[in-house]
């Protein structure tokens, strides 16, 4: 039975040109995390494999950095980066847990005036 839960940073916003850390945390389970996939819609951004380490998709190499931890850092943000991001935890023996983060990238002037998502 899958008892774990994924905690994420929820809905977040960031300035165009800036950077943001996407973080998920798996709790309430003793399952072993074998791999974490980071995806944007259906596009694979990066994989962190417990044995084989980090691998960043070639198309994101210039703008994505591994970490901290199992998280992912997105750099040089553009408005096109706005959207849903998923952390997919592959675990043994539980199976797969998925967390969702919604990122909105704002024009600098909008961000400076304090437009922010409320984290539920």
């Amino acid at each position: 039975m899958m008892t774990g839960t994924i905690e994420t940073t929820g809905n977040i916003s960031a300035e165009k040109g800036g950077s943001i850390i996407l973080q998920c945390h798996l709790s309430s389970t003793t399952a072993q995390v074998t791999q974490v996939n980071w995806e944007q819609q259906d596009q694979l951004l990066a994989i962190c494999n417990a044995d084989l380490g980090w691998h960043i998709s070639p198309s994101f190499k210039d703008r994505v950095a591994p970490g901290p931890g199992l998280g992912l850092t997105l750099q040089s943000l553009t408005v096109n980066d706005t959207g849903e991001y998923f952390c997919i935890y592959h675990t043994y023996p539980d199976g797969t847990y998925t967390g969702r983060i919604f990122l909105e990238v704002l024009e600098s002037s909008v961000a400076e005036h304090g437009a922010r998502f409320q984290i539920p």
Partner: nanobody
Framework: EVQLVESGGGLVQAGGSLRLSCAAS????????MGWFRQAPGKERELVST????????YYADSVKGRFTISADNAKNTVYLQMNSLKPEDTAVYYC??????????WGQGTQVTVSS
């Protein structure tokens, strides 16, 4: 399922070279990385080197940098580990591994490398 078969191990004198091969078969379409690990008697398994499926990204453990080179022939579904300037401390069983997007790792049976002084 992905099947991995290693070859190329053997006995070599210190300073010599060996080239390990790892032939992959089966459902390799989902593989995003392949790599080599080694395990010496009484020691923990150590990641030696990895290469991404597109060959664009490689990793080397500090202990083998400048001596070992990983490469891939995608047409043959084979990954190679060229090992030069071998040292007695490189003696170990070398295992090939493949990582898949679905979070499953596959392992070969291993090939023995012995470096004599």
């Amino acid at each position: 399922e992905v099947q991995l078969v290693e070859s190329g191990g053997g006995l070599v004198q210190a300073g010599g070279s060996l080239r390990l091969s790892c032939a992959a078969s089966g459902s390799t379409f989902d593989t995003y990385v392949m790599g080599w690990f080694r395990q010496a008697p009484g020691k923990e398994r150590e990641l030696v080197s990895t290469i991404s499926s597109d060959g664009d990204s490689t990793y080397y453990a500090d202990s083998v940098k400048g001596r070992f080179t990983i490469s891939a022939d995608n047409a043959k579904n084979t990954v190679y580990l060229q090992m030069n300037s071998l040292k007695p401390e490189d003696t170990a069983v070398y295992y090939c591994a493949a990582g898949t997007r679905r979070g499953r790792n596959y392992w070969g049976q291993g090939t023995q490398v012995t470096v004599s002084s």
